[in-house]
Interface confidence: medium
């Protein structure tokens, strides 16, 4: 058993039929010494009297608020959750495993630049009765700084029969070196609780490997005199890091037809602009991604060619 | 090249340089970029790599005040890495493809360092400990690890070189 | 040729300081972590202390945390372990020692130096 | 844990293999391979002999071997000479970045 945060304790159990569970001792916060009586959650059942009570935690009908009593009075709470562990694997219930990159992955996390900041996410379908705590560092063993907000509730989507729901949260690294080759990963914990079922989730990575910059900005197209060529132009987007001499991208152009089965034309270049063919009811598209280091591309930015 | 008493390096080949460096690292181990080189413990144990770091002056600031340092800690690395790719763990089993770029980047870190340091200037470099991998499984994975290494160090590199050929070059 | 060298043991009373300093020489002591370990009379080896070599990251035995603080200059090529509040059972020869850790390999006290000695007593 | 458990002591004719264990816990021995061993002679400095549980560093004769199974190390010295009598220490890194050795092991040679 371990405490969460203040009265919140978690018990880990190892979940198989007639496991024989934690014994939990519950010590009443107080001074007083006679006269108490404990319950759980909202039964009126006295379960045991004595400032400690010692409970066999099984399944989660053992789990819930114990509450201390004195003559009518409430002198303190222990909220008890439970842990499971199957097989030696602790649950993951609570979230959805998002299959990308990997099995596995219940949170994934991006950075539109190398300032250090960075969003994650995850989805679950449960709806109500569900809290998140996010903790993030660099390093573990010597662990530096990251800020986290809360986790919100960012999107709700349904998938077949079932609703989808997307939290997300904003973690910033306290002292950032943008320029400097990481070493050290970041560490990121998600602390899960459903009712009383505890879970927690880690994702470990470099800000490097998980950058996605925005799509360019003002993308236009510019039409050259006695040809079907036009000039293509873009800009950086406002959120990569500067100066750009130093944080540079590289760009994807693709020209895609009404079609999807039509040939797409691609050029690659560094430069923040192209020349290309713009056929008859095509779109001009164009994507960024760190100039020195493979990481993901950017979404399109896209101009129809008419 | 870079001059002891500081002179400047020749940007522009440096840039060149770098630009094919990162190409390569990629190219080399492509697919490394989608597997999770970081077991438990790792934390601790890839500490001792010569790691391009805040202190080290390779910011955009830093190498308008003073790009020598810098360009020893990349010289360092360079070296570092150029020794690891000549070593037994990519010359021994399991044979690299005759096609590999794992030639070509030796090469290409050999010849940059050599654009940073000139016959007759010798900054100190590290002497690279011996890692003998005693199995072709893990020389394998120690090939995955280095060249996912070697892909940060570079991309960070070549940031230095691209800003000084763009904002530095007289 | 790898050289390591102690300097800095002698005799001191409980509670008193000594600092202790190993010269490196034959290699790069800017890139190895490095340790210090510990060997009381006719007793074990015992690890005491490491340091990353950029010094951004120190590690330390239960028995010394809190009194000794293991410390670098990398320009000077010189380690350091200043030892504060020592006690009787600190009574040991003290060996600088290099170690490395390279993609998930790790490897302690490849090369050792010949030691120091301390003696704590009243 | 402080320290890694290893016999006291280990003897053998010359010619015999003899095996020292070195048993720890899953926090360092049985947490990963990262484990040494040490030959000390009277008066000279330790030496290592072995590291990654097998790996030889060059100019150590193939007469020592190491191997590992769960949270137990093992060294091997094949062919026993009276030059091996001398003390030897297991050492592991641990999961949480330190270091701890093994109580050593005189071995002499009958």
């Known amino acids: 058993i371990w405490e969460l945060k203040k009265d919140v304790y978690v018990v880990e159990l190892d979940w198989y039929p007639d496991a024989p569970g934690e014994m939990v001792v519950l010590t009443c916060d107080t001074p007083e010494e006679d006269g108490i009586t404990w319950t759980l959650d909202q039964s009126s059942e006295v379960l045991g009297s004595g400032k400690t009570l010692t409970i066999q935690v099984k399944e989660f009908g053992d789990a819930g608020q114990y509450t201390c009593h004195k003559g009518g009075e409430v002198l303190s709470h222990s909220l008890l959750l439970l842990h499971k562990k199957e097989d030696g694997i602790w649950s993951t219930d609570i979230l959805k495993d998002q299959k990308e990159p990997k099995n596995k992955t219940f949170l994934r996390c991006e950075a539109k630049n190398y300032s250090g900041r960075f969003t994650c996410w995850w989805l679950t379908t449960i709806s109500t009765d569900l809290t998140f705590s996010v903790k993030s560092s660099r390093g573990s063993s010597d662990p530096q700084g990251v800020t986290c907000g809360a986790a919100t509730l960012s999107a709700e989507r349904v998938r077949g029969d079932n609703k989808e729901y997307e939290y997300s949260v904003e973690c910033q690294e306290d002292s950032a070196c943008p320029a400097a080759e990481e070493s050290l990963p970041i560490e990121v914990m998600v602390d899960a609780v459903h009712k009383l079922k505890y879970e927690n989730y880690t994702s470990s990575f470099f800000i490097r490997d998980i950058i996605k910059p925005d799509p360019p900005k003002n993308l236009q197209l510019k039409p050259l005199k006695n040809s079907r060529q036009v000039e293509v132009s873009w800009e950086y987007p406002d959120t990569w890091s500067t100066p750009h001499s130093y944080f540079s991208l590289t760009f994807c152009v693709q020209v895609q037809g009404k079609s999807k089965r039509e040939k797409k034309d691609r050029v690659f270049t560094d430069k923040t602009s192209a020349t290309v063919i713009c056929r008859k009811n095509a779109s001009i598209s164009v994507r960024a991604q760190d100039r020195y280091y493979s990481s993901s591309w950017s979404e399109w930015a896209s101009v129809p060619c008419s | 090249r870079a001059v002891p008493g500081g002179s400047s390096p020749a940007w522009t080949q440096c840039q060149q340089l770098s630009q094919k460096l990162c190409t390569l690292a990629w190219s080399a181990h492509p697919l490394v970029g989608h597997m999770d080189l970081r077991e438990e413990g790792d934390e601790e144990t890839t500490n001792d790599v010569p790691h391009i770091q805040c202190g080290d002056g390779c910011d955009p600031q830093g190498l308008r005040d003073n790009s020598q340092f810098c360009l020893q800690r990349i010289h360092q690395g360079l070296i570092f890495y150029e020794k690891l790719l000549g070593s037994d763990i990519f010359t021994g089993e399991p044979s690299l493809l005759p096609d590999s770029p794992v030639g070509q980047l030796h090469a290409s870190l050999l010849g940059l360092s050599q654009l940073l340091q000139p016959e007759g200037h010798h900054w100190e470099t590290q002497q690279i400990p011996s890692l003998s991998p005693s199995q072709p499984w893990q020389r394998l994975l120690l090939r995955f690890k280095i060249l996912r290494s070697l892909q940060a160090f570079v991309a960070v590199a070549a940031r230095v070189f691209a800003h000084g050929a763009a904002t530095l070059s007289p | 040729e790898v050289q390591l060298l102690e300097s800095g043991g002698g005799l001191v009373q409980p509670g008193g300081s000594l600092r202790l300093s190993c010269a490196a020489s034959?290699?790069?002591?800017?890139?190895?972590?490095m340790m210090w370990v510990r060997q009381a009379p006719g007793k074990g080896l015992e690890w005491v202390s490491s340091i990353r070599p950029s010094g951004g990251m120190t590690m330390y035995a239960d028995s010394v945390k809190g009194r000794f603080t293991i410390s670098r200059d990398n320009s000077k090529n010189t380690l350091y372990l200043q030892m504060n509040s020592l006690r009787a059972e600190d009574t040991a020869v003290y060996y600088c020692?290099?170690?490395?850790?390279?993609?998930?390999?790790?490897?302690?006290?490849?090369?050792w130096g010949q030691g120091t000695l301390v003696t704590v007593s009243s | 844990q402080s320290e890694l458990t290893q016999p006291a002591s280990v003897s053998g004719s010359p010619g015999q293999s003899i095996t020292i264990s070195c048993s720890g816990t899953?926090?360092?021995?049985?947490?990963?391979?990262?484990v040494s061993w040490y030959q000390e002679r009277p008066g000279k400095v330790p030496k290592l002999i072995i590291y990654d549980v097998n790996n030889r560093p060059s100019g150590i004769s193939s007469r020592f071997s190491g191997s590992k199974s769960g949270n137990t190390a093992s060294l091997t010295i094949s062919g026993l000479q009276a030059e091996d009598e001398a003390d030897y220490f297991c050492?592991?890194?641990?999961?949480?970045?330190?270091?701890?050795f093994g109580t050593g092991t005189k071995v002499t040679v009958l």
């Open positions: 020692t290099r170690g490395w850790a390279l993609f998930g390999v790790v490897r302690m006290g490849d090369y």
């Open positions: 050492n592991s890194y641990t999961i949480t970045g330190t270091y701890v």
């Open positions: 899953s926090s360092d021995v049985g947490g990963h391979n990262f």
């Open positions: 034959g290699f790069t002591f800017s890139m190895y972590r």
